[in-house]
Structures are given as C-alpha cells and as structure tokens.
C-alpha cells in the first residue's frame, strides 16, 4: 500500500513536470534506492545538477534568457571536479558562455545565481581577465587546458545551462 501511494505520487509529479520537460531521464538513488533524481532528456547529470550544452550562437544576455526559459541559468562552476565533468562534453575549438559577468566593468565578477564569487575557486586562463571592456566570461580550450576568458558580452557564443536535479 505504501509503495502504491509512493508510485501514484511519483506519477502525478511526473505529469506535472511533463508540461515543462517532454522527457525526463531518472535514476534511483538514496540509501534505500527509494528516491529518483531526474534530468530533462538529453541533459547530463553530475552530483545534484543537470547540464545542457546549447550550440545556438547567442549573446550572453540572450544565452541567459534561453537557459531561463528552460528553468535553468547559465552555468555556475563551483569546483574543479564540476568543471572537469562539464568539459568532457565540450568541443575544444568552441567557446561557451558561463553564468559569470562583470556588468559595470569594475572587475566585480558575479554569478547569475548570486553565488559569491570566490577568487580562490576560479579557473581563468593565464593573464585573464584582461580587459574591463570585456564583461562576460567564456570557457574555452587554450594552451592544452580548459579555462576562462573575458569577452565582449554581445559576441555570440555557445553556452552551458545548469539546473538543479528534479527529485520525485
């Protein structure tokens, strides 16, 4: 009976999310394998988040709006492990917007989700950021490694969206 009611709850939750995400990919987790964590298909999952690589070339503002429409934000990178996971799925000859910007050019970098900007957990390429005119951050492959660079916000780039996993 308990299992039945849990299944019914899950199904109603799935139906609720169905209007936003036509397809969800879910995995069982938790100590009793009772919880399901889901990401929209074909998003990828890492820890408690889902990631989507958009190959549509858009400005930073339009990229953030695009993520927002999907219930996400441009990616906020909190650890080296997270960055290493993300970059596995990126093309080395492309650049991708991050959810990191300096809208006033004061070198006060800010994440879109208001996560505090921690200088100790940043992955700027050597010599970057290097221009107060360049107020948005990308991740790209340079000098044999992935890192961040500041660029003009209105120059179209690919982008990475991030959202919290859906738990049902």
């Amino acid at each position: 009976n308990f299992m039945y009611s849990k299944t019914v709850k899950r199904l109603s939750k799935l139906q609720e999310y169905q209007q936003y995400y036509p397809s969800l990919t879910c995995v069982m987790e938790g100590k009793d394998m009772e919880d399901w964590s889901c990401c929209p298909t074909p998003w990828t999952s890492f820890q408690s988040s889902c990631y989507f690589i958009s190959t549509v070339m858009q400005s930073w503002t339009k990229s953030q709006n695009n993520c927002s429409v999907m219930g996400a934000d441009l990616v906020v990178i909190n650890t080296k492990e997270e960055q290493d996971f993300i970059t596995q799925n990126l093309k080395i000859n492309s650049a991708y917007f991050l959810g990191l910007s300096d809208p006033k050019g004061w070198r006060h970098w800010q994440w879109v989700d208001q996560t505090p900007y921690n200088k100790n957990v940043t992955f700027w390429h050597s010599g970057e950021p290097n221009s107060p005119d360049e107020r948005c951050a990308i991740i790209n492959f340079r000098s044999e490694e992935w890192g961040w660079n500041d660029v003009h916000c209105h120059v179209p780039q690919k982008s990475i969206c991030k959202m919290k996993k859906i738990y049902i």
Partner: antibody, heavy 121, light 111 residues
C-alpha cells in the same frame, strides 16, 4: 580633444587589397576597444570589425569574415584594417570609432571623419 | 541578425516643433532593466555623432531637447523643439548582439 584620423582609402580593383589606418590622439589608446564601421553610398551604416584593447580578441560580421583583418599597434596609437579580396559591395566610407561599454552592450562614442574606399574595375 | 526598422524615412517639421522618430527591432534588445539601443545624428559630410545610449540616456554635451524612450522592441527619439542645426539623418543602433545593426535612417528637414 579626441581625434581619430583615417587614411589609406582609394580606388582598387575587385579582388585587390587595401590597408586602412586610424591614428588616434587625445585618448589613452591602449585602453580602448576599437571598431571600424562603413557606410556605402545611400545605405545604412554597417559594423565591420572590432578589436579589444590588448589586440587578442577580434570580431567580424559574416560579410567580411575571412577577408578583413583588424589589428592595432598600441605603441603607435594606430588602428588598422587590412582588406583583401575586395568586392564592389565593399565600396563605402570607412570610419574608425572608439567603443564604450554600457553594461552588457556598448556605444560607439568618438568617430573619425572617414576614408573612402572605391572598388571598381 | 537583429533588424532595425525606422519610421518615417523622412520628416519635415517646423522650427520649434516636436520631431518624433521610431525604431522597431525584430526581437527584444532588453536585459535586466536595460535596453541596448543607441541613437546617432549624422549631418552631411560628417561622421555619426552619439546622442542617446541605452535607449534613454543623454550623451554628455548633447542638448536636452533630445530624448529617447522605449523598451523591448519599440524605441523613440524625440526632438522637443527643432532647431535649424538639427537638420540631419538620425540612426538607431542595437548593441545587444553581434552583428551590431543600424536602422535605415530618418532624414529630418525643416518645413
């Protein structure tokens, strides 16, 4: 007083090359992102190229990508536009302009007087 | 590309009267409370001159008879009391996304 002086325009045959220069004074040139904008006779203004202050990032519209190259020499306070494989539709007055950011966008605040490029056989 | 359509193509206004120029973008050029549209004035044989940035901010040194308004896709440049020296072509421009694009221009003359 800010002054931007373009030079290097002239008459060139289709397929030919030309190098435009823009000498800047009255500004700390090395701190400015710079752009080229052109205006064909009777047509609207068209953005052609942008280069950041350090010269390591350059941007172009599809109409000139692969044919035009923007560069700068901060020691000489000079901006350049190398134009190759010129076409009749590249005929225009070419202006250099300083770029000023505005949040996530920008404005072109100071403009030179322009130099005329005519592509014709 | 974002297309900017200006109207009217030309405008004849009496001295001291109001002139209004419209600019319509093919998609929104707003983000987080700012609009990325600028207005320029170009007199014959001269380069363009920045008048208004961010849709409504008056550039330093520009007379306050010039004003800008609008958001999203619809923007307006107003000259509250036309002076003889305002005879020129006026262009809107968007800087929200490359390639930067300009409107086709509006020629303002004296009636």
């Amino acid at each position: 007083e800010v002054q931007l002086l373009e030079s290097g325009g002239g008459l060139v045959q289709p397929g030919g090359s030309l190098r435009l220069s823009c000498a800047a004074s009255g500004i700390t040139f090395s701190t400015y992102t710079m752009s080229w904008v052109r205006q064909a006779p009777g047509k609207r203004l068209e953005w052609v190229a942008t280069i950041n202050s350090g010269g390591d990032n350059t941007y172009y519209p599809d109409s000139v990508k692969g044919r035009f190259t923007i560069s700068r020499d901060n020691s000489k306070n000079t901006l350049y536009l190398q134009m190759n494989s010129l076409r009749a539709e590249d005929t225009a007055v070419y202006y250099c302009a300083t770029y000023r950011p505005y949040y996530y966008g920008s404005v072109l605040d100071y403009w030179g007087q322009g130099t005329t490029v005519t592509v014709s056989s | 590309d974002i297309v900017l359509t200006q109207s009217p193509d030309s405008l004849a206004v009496s001295l001291g009267e109001r002139a209004t120029i419209n600019c319509k973008a093919s998609q929104s050029v707003d983000y987080d409370g700012n609009s990325y549209v600028n207005w320029y004035q170009q007199k014959p044989g001269q380069p363009p001159k920045l008048l208004i940035y961010g849709a409504s901010n008056l550039e330093s040194g520009i007379p306050d008879r010039f004003s800008g308004s609008g958001s999203g896709t619809d923007f307006t440049l107003t000259i509250s009391s036309l002076q003889a020296e305002d005879v020129a072509v006026y262009y809107c421009q968007q800087s929200d996304e490359d390639p930067w694009t300009f409107g086709g221009g509006t020629k303002v003359e004296i009636k």
